[in-house]
């Protein structure tokens, strides 16, 4: 079986180390710099001539399938713009995945794969936890209660950390609309200790498979391959993922040919990231570049704004952003059936939000 | 769930051709090689060939170079086996099945060549 | 072309009792790096092959414990500890290490 995706988890861990714990990303090789000198001189030219014989290794049983030849250039590209020579020595095995914090005080420990009642045992009081959604043209509910539309097109990434990589594929809702729809997510559960082997996770409209890419349910044969699972209340329109050994909580469904996401996490977990992983739109909401005014939008199809207004109101009676972001999706849709992907973000921030009183944000525009 | 589903067999007289599709769902299908491999009947299984995620390369058994020709379209989801110059012994069950290494099969679909 | 015998070809067995299968390659299966890619299916009457056994001793996803893979070089090993009812079928290795990728003739397992 192609084991592609644990050469990727090696030598992303091995950078963490060269870096001082922030993430490189499986192929951003961690940038020019780095702490302690060690990337962008021999000890990331190490990782690569690593990552490149694991790569070689995997051939026979990965050379058909695209990750593999991403990997393949990916590092081909790396060690010419690193200047890293062909022969050379390799890093050593990186350890099985980043720690948790608090760990290494006196208590006995808790199961590593429990996220929460490992925080709590250590720290005397439960992590915070934080909210992420993303829903119709698209909108973001940011982790710090931002509340954007955007009109990112193609591949965007909602989440970039240490522990998780989730990416968002949009594309015009109707010919020449500004507004987009996500019609692709990518998740990536990234390799952890005894807990989890690397899991993918990938939902395209009418395709919500409750299975990772290599067909399991859970997080692997490791000790802890349960603290990963995924499961439906609704098959075809709703999955939901738990991640226990993050404290993790993600939500995709599927509503009038687009898919939402949304995300409880832990604090710290959510924050394990570096400078070069500025970009998560969970993080900070859309670019300037990237964000709709409310003025921008084009009525398509025969729905007026009363109308539309009223559709919103039967089930969003607060007008708060998720209602004004319902009004718009069925204004530049034409399609009332958005009125459900609102109103699922709505409940699932009710479920996820530590704060109820931030539930209701009010947009400025 | 990953489903493979083939379709287009049947009965064909030798030297004919038939053309099986393979109809994949519950993966990303444009990321993974994709194999043939068929089962005569009563016997075992016989590795036909395979096509690289996008096209780029396609392997075959010296058994049926030349005769048989896969490709696949990435858009439709869906992977191809088309079968020229057929003789008595290319009659079996025909699978496809998921990834550079198979891990997961369809169902087959029944290819019987006779006069 | 790399030529993989099973045996024994038939194979019966008692209920709870454990079973072994025999698969022996014309060559090393060693690749140059020094992996081994041994794999093993199986195929219950009227359904399609199923992956029991990659890289000769990794359990694929949702298979049984009972089954376990072993071998190295041209001499390899499928084991069921206890044989279930639902294990009767045919068993068939595979390896890809050299192209082109071979499968052995099959092993029928059956209840006695």
């Known amino acids: 079986q192609c084991k592609i995706l644990r050469c990727n988890a090696e030598y992303v861990s091995s950078t963490l180390s060269l870096r001082g714990g922030g993430s490189s990303g499986a192929l951003r090789g961690g940038g020019g710099g780095g702490r302690g000198g060690g990337v962008g001189s021999g000890g990331l030219c190490r990782a690569l001539r690593s990552y490149a014989l694991c790569t070689r290794r995997t051939a026979r049983t990965c050379r058909g399938d695209l990750a593999f030849h991403s990997a393949v250039h990916g590092i081909e590209d790396l060690m010419i713009q690193h200047n890293c020579s062909r022969q050379g020595p390799t890093a050593p095995p990186p350890p099985r995945g980043p720690a948790l914090p608090g760990a290494g005080s006196g208590l006995p420990a808790p199961d590593p794969c429990d996220y929460e009642g490992r925080f709590s045992r250590l720290h005397g009081r439960p992590p915070g936890f934080l909210h992420c959604a993303s829903f119709g043209d698209p909108h973001v509910r940011s982790f710090h209660h931002h509340f954007h539309t955007c009109r990112v097109q193609g591949a965007w990434p909602l989440l970039d950390n240490d522990f998780l990589f989730v990416q968002a594929t949009s594309s015009p809702m109707a010919l020449g609309a500004n507004a987009t729809a996500t019609r692709k997510l990518t998740i990536i559960f990234k390799n952890m200790q005894e807990c989890i082997d690397q899991k993918v996770y990938q939902a395209e409209v009418d395709n919500l498979p409750v299975a990772f890419e290599d067909g399991s349910i859970n997080g692997g044969d490791r000790p802890g391959g349960s603290s990963l699972s995924i499961q439906t209340a609704n098959p075809g329109n709703h999955v939901e993922i738990q991640a226990a050994y993050i404290g993790t909580t993600i939500i995709i469904r599927q509503t009038a040919g687009q898919l939402s996401f949304s995300i409880k996490v832990a604090e710290d977990v959510a924050m394990a990231f570096s400078a070069e992983q500025d970009l998560q739109l969970c993080v900070g909401g859309c670019p300037p570049s990237q964000r709709l005014s409310r003025s921008e939008r084009n009525r398509r199809g025969a729905i007026t704004i009363d109308t539309a207004r009223r559709l919103c109101k039967e089930g969003l009676p607060v007008e708060d952003a998720y209602f004004h972001s319902c009004v718009f999706d069925v204004l530049i849709s034409g399609d009332p059936n958005f009125t459900v992907a609102a109103q699922a973000a709505l409940e699932d921030a009710r479920a996820f939000l530590p704060d109820l009183e931030k539930l209701h944000l009010f947009p400025s525009d | 769930e990953v489903q493979l589903v083939e379709s287009g067999g049947g009965l064909v007289q030798p030297g004919g051709s038939l053309r099986l599709s393979c109809a994949a769902s519950g993966f990303t299908f444009s990321n993974y090689g994709m194999n043939w491999i068929r089962q005569a009947p009563g016997k075992g299984l016989e590795w036909i060939g395979m096509i690289y995620y996008d096209s780029s390369e396609k392997h075959y058994a010296d058994s049926v170079k030349g005769r048989f020709t896969i490709s696949r379209d990435n858009s439709k989801n869906t992977l191809y086996l088309q079968m020229n110059s057929l003789r008595a012994e290319d009659t079996a069950v025909y699978y496809c099945?998921?990834?550079?290494?198979?891990?997961?099969w369809g169902q087959g679909t029944m290819v019987t060549v006779s006069s | 072309d790399v030529v993989l015998t099973q045996s024994p070809l038939s194979l019966p067995v008692t209920l709870g009792q454990p079973a072994s299968i025999s698969c022996r390659s014309s060559?090393?299966?060693?690749?140059?790096?020094?992996?081994?890619?041994l794999e093993w299916f199986q195929q219950r009457p009227g359904q399609s092959p199923r992956l029991l056994i990659y890289?000769?001793?990794t359990r694929f996803s949702g298979v049984p414990d009972r089954f376990s893979g072993s071998g190295s070089g041209t001499d390899f090993t499928l084991k069921i500890s206890r044989v279930e009812a639902e294990d009767v079928g045919v068993y068939y290795c595979?390896?890809?290490?050299?192209?082109?990728?071979?499968f052995g003739q099959g092993t029928k397992l059956e209840i006695k």
């Open positions: 595979f390896q890809v290490t050299h192209d082109p990728v071979t």
């Open positions: 890289d000769v001793s």
């Open positions: 099945a998921k990834g550079t290494t198979p891990d997961y």
């Open positions: 060559q090393s299966l060693e690749s140059s790096d020094g992996d081994t890619f």
